[in-house]
Interface confidence: low
C-alpha cells in the first residue's frame, strides 16, 4: 500500500519484578514516488567507442537503477547504434510503478564531427575562429544538434565562434561540446596561441647627411618580436628598399645623389603565419651639394667677323641650389671676357679680328663650379676694312 504501519511491542520488567506491557507505538511514513516521477528529469551522457562505432548511454543517477528492455551495467546502457532510438525502462526500490520509460535518442557518431580552426592567417595575431565541421553524413535530425563553446568566461551557443581583439602571442583555451536533443555526446578542447603580432615601430635616433653622396640613419629596435628590418629611401619618384639584419641599429647609405631630398622609412617585420610589417618610422634629409656635371652640346658660332654666339645645354646633374652659367674667353693665356648668365646663351662682341680664342663654358650651382666645356674658335679678318681698302684701289 501507499502507506504502511511500523508497529512494535516492548516488554519491560518493573522494579517489583512483575511484567508490564507498554503501549504500542505506531508510525506512518510518507508514500514512495513513482519511478516515472522520480526519474522525470534524468539526464544522459553518450560515450562513443571509436573501435566498435557504438555508443554507451550513461544514466546520471545517484543510485544503481534497474533497467528493463535493455541491460544496464553500472547505470550504463551499452552497444547503442548511432541515430537509432532505444527504449529503456528505469525502476528502483525507492520508487513505485509506473517505471520511467526513457527514450534514448542516440546521437550521430563522434568521428563525423571535427573541430576546425577557421582563423584567417592574416588575422591570426588578434583573432581565433573555431568551427565544427560535419565531415560525414548521418541520418540523425540536424535540427536536434546544438553546439556550445566556452572560452574563458565567455559562452557561445554557435557552431562557429570568432574571438576578436585578442593579444598576440597569447594562449587561449576553448572548450566545446556538441549536444543532441540537449544530451552531450562529444566535446573537444583547443589551446590556441595567437600568432606573432606586427612588430612595433623602430625609434629613429638620428637621420642625416653629412656628405654629398652619403647619409646615415640610426635607430632603436622595437620591443616586440621581429625578424628583420626593411629600410626604404625615396628620392622624387624613385624608391629603393633594403633588407637589413635584425641586429643592426645603424645603416650608412652610399652612392646618393647630391643636393637631393631623401625620405627614409624604416619598419621591422616578422615572418609568422604571414609576413607582418610593423609601423614605419619616417625621417628625411637633403644631401650636401657637389660640383655639377659638365654643360654639354656647347656651340660657338660667328655672328660677325669679331662676334660670337656661344650656347650650351644645362648639365645633367646640377647638384646644388642655384643655376648660373659662366663663360670665360681667353686669348693666349689672357682672360679677356668673363660673363655670367641665367641661361647658357652668350653673345660675345667686339673681339679682336683674326685672333684665336678659347671659350670655356661651365655651370655654377651656388656652391661649386662644374668642369668647363672648352672650344677653340678664331675671329675673321675685318671684311669691312678689307672691302673698303679694295675700293680705294
Amino acid at each position: 500500500s501507499d502507506a504502511y504501519l511500523n508497529a512494535s511491542e516492548t516488554t519491560t520488567l518493573s522494579p517489583s519484578g512483575s511484567a508490564v506491557i507498554s503501549t504500542t507505538t505506531i508510525a506512518t511514513t510518507p508514500s514512495k514516488p513513482t519511478c516515472d516521477e522520480k526519474y522525470a528529469n534524468i539526464t544522459v551522457d553518450y560515450l562513443y567507442n571509436k573501435e566498435t562505432k557504438l555508443f554507451t548511454a550513461k544514466l546520471n543517477v545517484n543510485e544503481n537503477v534497474e533497467c528493463g528492455n535493455n541491460t544496464c551495467t553500472n547505470n550504463e546502457v551499452h552497444n547503442l547504434t548511432e541515430c537509432k532510438n532505444a527504449s529503456v525502462s528505469i525502476s528502483h526500490n525507492s520508487c513505485t510503478a509506473p517505471d520511467k520509460t526513457l527514450i534514448l535518442d542516440v546521437p550521430p557518431g563522434v568521428e563525423k564531427f571535427q573541430l576546425h580552426d577557421c582563423t584567417q592567417v592574416e588575422k591570426a595575431d588578434t583573432t581565433i575562429c573555431l568551427k565544427w565541421k560535419n565531415i560525414e553524413t548521418f541520418t540523425c535530425d540536424t535540427q536536434n544538434i546544438t553546439y556550445r563553446f566556452q572560452c574563458g568566461n565567455m559562452i557561445f551557443d554557435n557552431k562557429e565562434i570568432k574571438l576578436e581583439n585578442l593579444e598576440p602571442e597569447h594562449e587561449y583555451k576553448c572548450d566545446s561540446e556538441i549536444l543532441y536533443n540537449n544530451h552531450k555526446f562529444t566535446n573537444a578542447s583547443k589551446i590556441i596561441k595567437t600568432d606573432f603580432g606586427s612588430p612595433g615601430e623602430p625609434q629613429i635616433i638620428f637621420c642625416r647627411s653629412e656628405a654629398a653622396h652619403q647619409g646615415v640613419i640610426t635607430w632603436n629596435p622595437p620591443q616586440r618580436s621581429f625578424h628583420n628590418f626593411t629600410l626604404c629611401y625615396i628620392k622624387e619618384t624613385e624608391k629603393d628598399c633594403l633588407n637589413l639584419d635584425k641586429n643592426l641599429i645603424k645603416y650608412d647609405l652610399q652612392n646618393l645623389k647630391p643636393y637631393t631630398k631623401y625620405v627614409l622609412s624604416l619598419h621591422a617585420y616578422i615572418i609568422a603565419k604571414v609576413q607582418r610589417n610593423g609601423s614605419a618610422a619616417m625621417c628625411h634629409f637633403t644631401t650636401k651639394s657637389a660640383p655639377p656635371s659638365q654643360v654639354w652640346n656647347m656651340t660657338v658660332s660667328m655672328t660677325s667677323d669679331n662676334s660670337m654666339h656661344v650656347k650650351c645645354r644645362p648639365p645633367r646633374d646640377r647638384n646644388g641650389p642655384h643655376e648660373r652659367y659662366h663663360l670665360e674667353v681667353e686669348a693666349g693665356n689672357t682672360l679677356v671676357r668673363n660673363e655670367s648668365h641665367k641661361n647658357c646663351d652668350f653673345r660675345v662682341k667686339d673681339l679682336q679680328y683674326s685672333t684665336d680664342y678659347t671659350f670655356k663654358a661651365y655651370f655654377h650651382n651656388g656652391d661649386y663650379p662644374g668642369e668647363p666645356f672648352i672650344l677653340h674658335h678664331s675671329t675673321s679678318y675685318n671684311s669691312k676694312a678689307h672691302h673698303h681698302h679694295h675700293h680705294h684701289h
Partner: nanobody, 123 residues
C-alpha cells in the same frame, strides 16, 4: 671555449673617464658579438652596450648613450668600453660577455662571461 679577461677598472672622480678593455682568447673572436654588462651592489646585472661581430653595429642602454662608446679590434681580439662623464651611479662591477647570436641586450644570449672589473666613481 672562449676566455674573457677585463681590465681598466678603478677609482675615478665624477665627470672623469675610464677605458675598459676585454681580451679574448680560445676562440675565433670575429665570430662573436660582444657585450658589456654591469652589476651594482645589491642590484641585478644590467645591459650596458654591445657590438656586432664586424663592429658595424652597436647598441647602448639609455642610461649610458652619449657617454659610453663601445669598439672592438678584431686583430687584437679585444673589445673596449670608453666611459666618459662618469657619475656615482655608474659604480659597478663591469662584465664583458661574448655571444655567437648577438641579439642586443639579452644576457641569456651570451655564452661566455669574464670575471668582471670594478669601477668606482666617487669624490
Amino acid at each position: 671555449q672562449v676566455q674573457l679577461q677585463e681590465s681598466g677598472g678603478g677609482l675615478v672622480q665624477p665627470g672623469g673617464s675610464l677605458r675598459l678593455s676585454c681580451a679574448a682568447s680560445g676562440g675565433t673572436f670575429s665570430d662573436y658579438g660582444m657585450g658589456w654588462f654591469r652589476q651594482a651592489p645589491g642590484k641585478e646585472r644590467e645591459f650596458v652596450s654591445s657590438i656586432s661581430w664586424s663592429g658595424n653595429s652597436v647598441y647602448y642602454a639609455g642610461a649610458v648613450r652619449g657617454r659610453f662608446t663601445i669598439s672592438r679590434d678584431n686583430a687584437k681580439n679585444t673589445v673596449y668600453l670608453q666611459m666618459n662623464s662618469l657619475q656615482p651611479e655608474d659604480t659597478a662591477v663591469y662584465y664583458c660577455a661574448a655571444s655567437s647570436t648577438w641579439n642586443n641586450n639579452d644576457p641569456t644570449e651570451y655564452e661566455y662571461w669574464g670575471q668582471g672589473t670594478l669601477v668606482t666613481v666617487s669624490s
